[in-house]
């Protein structure tokens, strides 16, 4: 297994293997509808 920053969910995207599901600690809003960062 190659190790990437994102820790789950492989997806072939533009012929490149990338991780899809991201850690809940991600600050990018990978989880649909989950409030992230300091936004109020």
């Amino acid at each position: 297994d190659a190790e990437f920053r994102h820790d789950s969910g492989y997806e072939v995207h533009h012929q490149k293997l990338v991780f899809f599901a991201e850690d809940v600690g991600s600050n990018k809003g990978a989880i649909i509808g989950l409030m992230v960062g300091g936004v109020v």
């Epitope: 969910g9 990018k28 989950l34 992230v36």
Partner: antibody, heavy 112, light 111 residues
Framework: QVQLVQSGAEVKEPGASVKVSCKGS????????VHWLRQLPEKGLEWIGR????????IYTPKFQDKATLTVDTSTDTAYMELSSLRSEDTAVYYC?????WGQGTLVTVSS | DIVMTQSPLSNPVTPGEPASISCRSS???????????LYWYLQKPGQSPQLLIY???NLASGVPDRFSSSGSGTDFTLKISRVEAEDVGVYYC????????FGQGTKVEIK
């Protein structure tokens, strides 16, 4: 008030294209991924894809790879989803989502 | 695609009583990192959906603690300890182990 405001309902003929906008109000849209989903009439939710406004990187569900194009204009805090080659089966309410905020939904009706 | 299957599709409930919704995935959502990539959303009538539960058992901000979720790798349950009138709507389970897919929805209505 922080919110995502989507453009209004659209009626299109089969084969046409439509571009739906999603503007961040009191919200810096470039900070977080923008997800797009759709809800077919009386049906469940389908994830179309997402865009990272920081670098324009996109990921699509395979069935939408040739149907949807996601873009962001960071200068106006607006995300866009363009749908091409519309068919009656594309009639749905389309939602944008970023962080904990959802747009109100845009009804796209495809009818001749 | 990972297929998410919910039951029942309709669930008439009595206010003050408990209620539960089941969801099954066609593939285990438990990753080797110990996280389970299962989510619950609620769409109230006339509203956009909202996130209730993320990564199987974490309550989203502002969600009342009468909601809870549990499960294994493929079988999951959303429980409402005491249903309130404001809980009516369509509940969806979803996964993002591989992209995002949603269940067909369970409509919860007051008896």
């Amino acid at each position: 008030q922080v919110q995502l405001v989507q453009s209004g309902a659209e009626v299109k003929e089969p084969g046409a294209s439509v571009k739906v906008s999603c503007k961040g109000s009191g919200f810096n849209i470039k900070t977080y991924y923008v997800h797009w989903l759709r809800q077919l009439p009386e049906k469940g939710l389908e994830w179309i894809g997402r865009i990272d406004p920081e670098n324009g990187e996109t990921i699509y569900t395979p069935k939408f790879q040739d149907k949807a194009t996601l873009t962001v204009d960071t200068s106006t805090d607006t995300a866009y989803m363009e749908l091409s080659s519309l068919r009656s089966e594309d009639t749905a309410v389309y939602y944008c989502v970023s962080s904990g905020y959802w747009g109100q939904g845009t009804l796209v009706t495809v009818s001749s | 695609d990972i297929v998410m299957t919910q039951s029942p599709l309709s669930n008439p409930v009595t206010p003050g009583e408990p209620a539960s919704i089941s969801c099954r995935s066609s593939k285990s959502l438990l990753h080797r990192n110990g996280k389970t990539y299962l989510y619950w959303y609620l769409q109230k009538p006339g509203q956009s959906p909202q996130l209730l539960i993320y990564q199987m058992d974490n309550l989203a901000s502002g969600v009342p603690d009468r909601f809870s979720s549990s499960g294994s790798g493929t079988d999951f349950t959303l429980k409402i300890s005491r249903v309130e009138a404001e809980d009516v709507g369509v509940y969806y389970c979803a996964q993002n182990l591989e992209l995002w897919t949603f269940g067909q929805g369970t409509k919860v209505e007051i008896k």
